[in-house]
């Protein structure tokens, strides 16, 4: 019978700067039922608030919906673990939504083999930004990265596409089936997960670039 061990807020992520979620790891188990609560205040304010939504993000999480998410404000948050023996507190975590954006993967990745008559053939791919991200407002600059590999190969070949939503690759092995994926990241923030793999069969008569 011990008080709970010290919890740790280990991750906060936002898909689009409009909402965000934080997750914590419980500390050691005191062998008793333990309640967790996340409290926060905005830097410069003294009023403490409790997590508005413990459900949406899954176990040991706190989700901040649109009405609780402010840009350009730092959130100071802490998790309290309590059982009948006492309470333990996490270290405070300072969160600025601008720097925790992890977008959803890009959408609608299409890949084609192009074989123009007058030039070398190439692989052409295009995609769309994730729907939650509104690029028109200028709030976001999204950067993209592509990776591809022959189906049975172990190593991926990675290409940085910058802000483009299309890309060409010239050096490919004829007759191979390739997996292609794309991911994105905001200028300040984290890479998204890779998009689902798109498969493309390279024709046997595809001419390698010299």
């Amino acid at each position: 019978q011990l008080p709970p061990g010290k919890p740790e807020i280990f991750k906060c992520r936002s898909p689009n700067k409009e909402t965000f979620t934080c997750w914590w790891r419980p500390g050691t188990d005191g062998g008793l039922p333990t309640n967790y609560s996340l409290t926060y205040h905005r830097e410069g304010e003294t009023l403490m608030h409790e997590c508005p939504d413990y459900i949406t993000g899954g176990p040991n999480s706190c989700h901040f919906g649109k009405q609780y998410t402010s840009m350009w404000r730092t959130y100071v948050m802490m998790v309290n673990a309590t059982n009948q023996m006492g309470s333990s507190f996490s270290d405070e975590l300072y969160v600025d939504v601008t720097y925790i954006v992890q977008p959803d993967p890009p959408l609608e990745l299409t890949v084609e083999v192009k074989q123009p008559e007058d030039r070398k053939p190439y692989l052409w791919m295009k995609w769309s930004p994730p729907t939650l991200i509104d690029l028109k407002t200028g709030w976001f600059t999204l950067l993209y990265e592509i990776r591809l590999k022959p189906e049975k190969a172990a190593e991926w070949e990675t290409h940085f596409a910058g802000q483009q939503t299309e890309f060409k690759i010239l050096s490919l092995h004829p007759g191979q089936k390739y997996l292609v994926q794309v991911r994105c990241k905001p200028d300040h923030g984290y890479w998204s997960a890779w998009s689902p793999a798109t498969f493309i069969q390279i024709p046997s008569d595809f001419i390698m670039n010299d």
């Epitope: 019978q1 062998g31 039922p33 006492g86």
Partner: antibody
Framework: QVQLVQSGAEVKKPGASVKVSCKAS????????ITWVRQAPGQGLEWMGW????????DYAQKFQDRVTMTTDTSTTTGYMEMRSLTSDDTAVYYC??????????WGQGTLVTVSS | DIQMTQSPSSLSASVGDRVTITCRAS??????LAWFQQKPGKAPKSLIY???SLQSGVPSKFSGGGSGTDFALTISSLQPEDFATYYC?????????FGQGTRLEIK
């Protein structure tokens, strides 16, 4: 009201085993556990270990690790402490205690275990 | 293991006196400290938990203080029923450990 009622005094021979019970009532047994503390004659209090009625977890003081077993039975709301290979140094009053709302807020009346040849 | 050192080991005082018993932990125990009173032939009784919080039903003449490694129990005005042995206990980590006790006697 909360009560912890322990089994009666025991006299044991060296090398024997003893099993002390602690019957709990008046609170939700399954959200706590039973801790065992002993006190040799004229000596201080010594924590022996505990058994969780919540998740079955047990923790023992190292000196008792090899010869003590603590259990809780939620169907009878009873905690048990069994000690094997008794010696005269184990002569003591054995107390059970629990956590209802606050740390160690309720105690049993104690069980005297005498080890003598 | 965390060692708990109580002082003094015995103390003589008169009815009406204010007395303080101290307890030092060998490392920081995050204020997870309890105080118990024990009378001869009786089970310990919890007085204080979390260094300074009074257990339900315990008179306010008992108070606890301190933090980190140094703690104290103060009895503000001794009554005949307060003469007993007092123990501190840390419950910050296993093994839970007690101080060696302070015997409070009538002068």
């Amino acid at each position: 009201q909360v009560q912890l009622v322990q089994s009666g005094a025991e006299v044991k021979k060296p090398g024997a085993s003893v099993k002390v019970s602690c019957k709990a009532s008046g609170y939700t047994f399954g959200t706590s556990g039973i801790t065992w503390v002993r006190q040799a004659p004229g000596q201080g209090l010594e924590w022996m270990g505990w058994s969780s009625a919540y998740n079955g977890k047990t923790d023992y003081a190292q000196k008792f690790q090899d010869r003590v077993t603590m259990t809780t039975d939620t169907s009878t709301t009873t905690g048990y402490m069994e000690m094997r290979s008794l010696t005269s140094d184990d002569t003591a009053v054995y107390y059970c205690t629990t956590v209802v709302r606050r740390p160690f807020d309720f105690w049993g009346q104690g069980t005297l275990v005498t080890v003598s040849s | 293991d965390i060692q708990m050192t109580q002082s003094p080991s015995s103390l003589s005082a008169s009815v009406g006196d204010r007395v303080t018993i101290t307890c030092r932990a060998s490392q920081d125990i995050n204020n997870f400290l309890a105080w118990f009173q024990q009378k001869p032939g009786k089970a310990p009784k919890s007085l204080i938990y979390a260094a300074s919080s009074l257990q339900s039903g315990v008179p306010s003449k008992f108070s606890g203080g301190g933090s980190g490694t140094d703690f104290a129990l103060t009895i503000s005005s001794l009554q005949p029923e307060d003469f007993a042995t007092y123990y501190c206990q840390q419950y910050s980590s296993y093994p839970i450990t007690f101080g060696q006790g302070t015997r409070l006697e009538i002068k």
